[in-house]
Amino acid sequence: IWELKKDVYVVELDWYPDAPGEMVVLTCDTPEEDGITWTLDQSSEVLGSGKTLTIQVKEFGDAGQYTCHKGGEVLSHSLLLLHKKEDGIWSTDILKDQKEPKNKTFLRCEAKNYSGRFTCWWLTTISTDLTFSVKSSRGSSDPQGVTCGAATLSAERVRGDNKEYEYSVECQEDSACPAAEESLPIEVMVDAVHKLKYENYTSSFFIRDIIKPDPPKNLQLKPLKNSRQVEVSWEYPDTWSTPHSYFSLTFCVQVQGKSKREKKDRVFTDKTSATVICRKNASISVRAQDRYYSSSWSEWASVPCS
Amino acid sequence: RNLPVATPDPGMFPCLHHSQNLLRAVSNMLQKARQTLEFYPCTSEEIDHEDITKDKTSTVEACLPLELTKNESCLNSRETSFITNGSCLASRKTSFMMALCLSSIYEDLKMYQVEFKTMNAKLLMDPKRQIFLDQNMLAVIDELMQALNFNSETVPQKSSLEEPDFYKTKIKLCILLHAFRIRAVTIDRVMSYLNAS
């Protein structure tokens, strides 16, 4: 058993049918010695008397808010949460496996640049009685500071019969140098509590590996005289690290017909312009990627050919 | 500890092409190592990230773009002085700081070259003959060093008398390649910045 926060405790249980559970001793936070009784949640049934209460915690019915009283007055509370270990592996019931970029990916994180700012998000089908708390650091043995905000509900979607909820959090490394070569990964730890179930999820990454630039901005077409060709031009996104000559991007220019089945023409360039043939009803899209370290491509910025 | 904007004309910078070749070569070699050594811990998540140049060179600090010198987190206190003549410095206007940066890159390349050659000698003794260093990568390191053309004492190749532990050597190869790829990215960024300045 360990303390999650004041008066909230997590009991770790080896979770299998007929498991013996864990013996827990609760102590009433009071100078009083006599006439103390214990109850669980809203029940008035007295579970025991005395300054300490010994309980065998086996399943969720044994978890909850234990309260010690004296003469009708509440003295203190202890909330017991359960953390299930199923065959050597901590349970992951609360969050959905996003399966990207690989199986067992519960937390996904992205950074728009090398400033040390990043966003993480996760999915759940649970809509109520759910709280998250996020901590982060650079490295784990001698951790350096990363400050995270509060997790917020950022999107809701319908997936088949289920509603899916997306939560996200923004974090900022306290002293980040965009040019630095990372040798220690960023660690992100999310505590999730649903009703009386506690789970924790972690992700470890280098900022360089989670870079995903914003799409190029100011995408424009300039028709070339007496030709089906157009000059496409664009600019680096505002959120990208500067100077651009040091933090350079490379670009992919795509000409896509109205039908998804039509052949796509693609051109790769380090410049901020390209000459392409504009077909009728087609659209031109441009996306960006770090020129020297191949992390994710940005989303497409698009303009119609007409 | 930083690069002023007064640097050579774009066409006067022969190192850019070599640094791009270097990044390509080390990335290919790392990919090959990951595939060949699939049963070894060779992914970025599994290896310890060690920098053999730590406390010996200060490339990131010495080559910091002018725009980032206002960022206190970028100004590390490590100072190292280097020999300051080189053929990539194609303009007399080139400052001492730029020479310091390029000579730091040269020292990095020299250290990695020695490590890779020593490692290759060990890998050639492996009866499994599982993996060797790409000669192209070694040649590209050499080409960039020649383009930088700094006078520097030659570092003797490390020779080891004990029987090599091939498992450890292959893990060390992965560690070295990951670190060298990261340094090659920095070198490419620096060359691109200098070329544009």
């Epitope: 080896d14 979770w15 299998y16 049918p17 007929d18 498991a19 399943e59 969720f60 270990k85 199923e86 065959d87 050597g88 592996i89 019931d93 690989k102 199986n103 067992k104 089908t125 | 049963f39 811990p41 599994e46």
Partner: antibody, heavy 115, light 112 residues
């Protein structure tokens, strides 16, 4: 004590369907994940499928994906395996099993796919 | 498609020490716990070892398990005639959990 009693096995022609059941008693069935495991005659153990305690997530071996469906009825304390488009290679003893460091197995039920 | 490899058979005379190996990889045994099962002919498997080296109550102490790196082993110290059975190791793969990964199985024969 924990008990898993299986039923539903038998002889079936290729291409036909069969449903196996596993009745649980002696524990809070709705709190635990459950597996199906099979063993072809003279062969080793092969995992077939898993279902979470609340039925929210299901996982299948590639060899049965799209043909077999694992389900549970927590009100009846019963686990099911619906098997469709059966093949000769599905011939095996099928076991249900609880998920956890200490597990309990059903007695097994024989499924024979033969024309 | 078994990724946990066991020897097909091992044998020993009563009182001898018999060991069975179970070889895997970094993503399974290297990252997860190992179990061992005993299966007597015509019966369901019986758990012998969980969490690499833990014995459930009721399992004789002549059975012991260990794990090192990407492989595990089961030892029967002072093998007895009633130990003649098939033995399976089991773990998970970190990418496919909760799918159970079973070993290929080992037939233990007690001679004499």
């Amino acid at each position: 004590q924990v008990q898993l009693v299986q039923s539903g096995g038998g002889v079936v022609q290729p291409g036909r369907s069969l449903r196996l059941s596993c009745a649980a008693s002696g524990f809070t069935f709705s709190s635990y994940g459950m597996h199906w495991v099979r063993q072809a005659p003279g062969k080793g153990l092969e995992w077939v499928a898993f279902i979470r305690y609340d039925g929210s997530n299901k996982y299948y071996a590639d060899s049965v994906k799209g043909r077999f469906t694992i389900s549970r009825d927590n009100s009846k304390n019963t686990l099911y395996l619906q098997m469709k488009s059966l093949r000769a290679e599905d011939t095996a003893v099928y076991y249900c099993k609880t998920h956890g460091s200490h597990d309990n197995w059903g007695q097994g039920t024989m499924v024979t796919v033969s024309s | 498609s078994y990724v946990l490899t066991q020897p097909p058979s091992v044998s020993g005379t009563p009182g001898q020490r018999v060991t069975i190996s179970c070889s895997g990889g970094r993503s399974n045994i290297g990252s997860n716990t190992v179990k061992w099962y005993q299966q007597l002919p015509g019966t369901a498997p019986k758990l012998l070892i969980y969490d690499n080296d833990q014995r459930p109550s009721g399992v004789p102490d002549r059975f012991s398990g260990s794990k090192s790196g990407t492989s595990a082993s089961l030892a029967i110290t002072g093998v007895q005639a009633e130990d003649e059975a098939d033995y399976y190791c089991q773990s998970y793969d970190r990418g496919t959990h909760p799918a159970l990964l079973f070993g290929t199985g080992t037939k233990v024969t007690v001679l004499g």
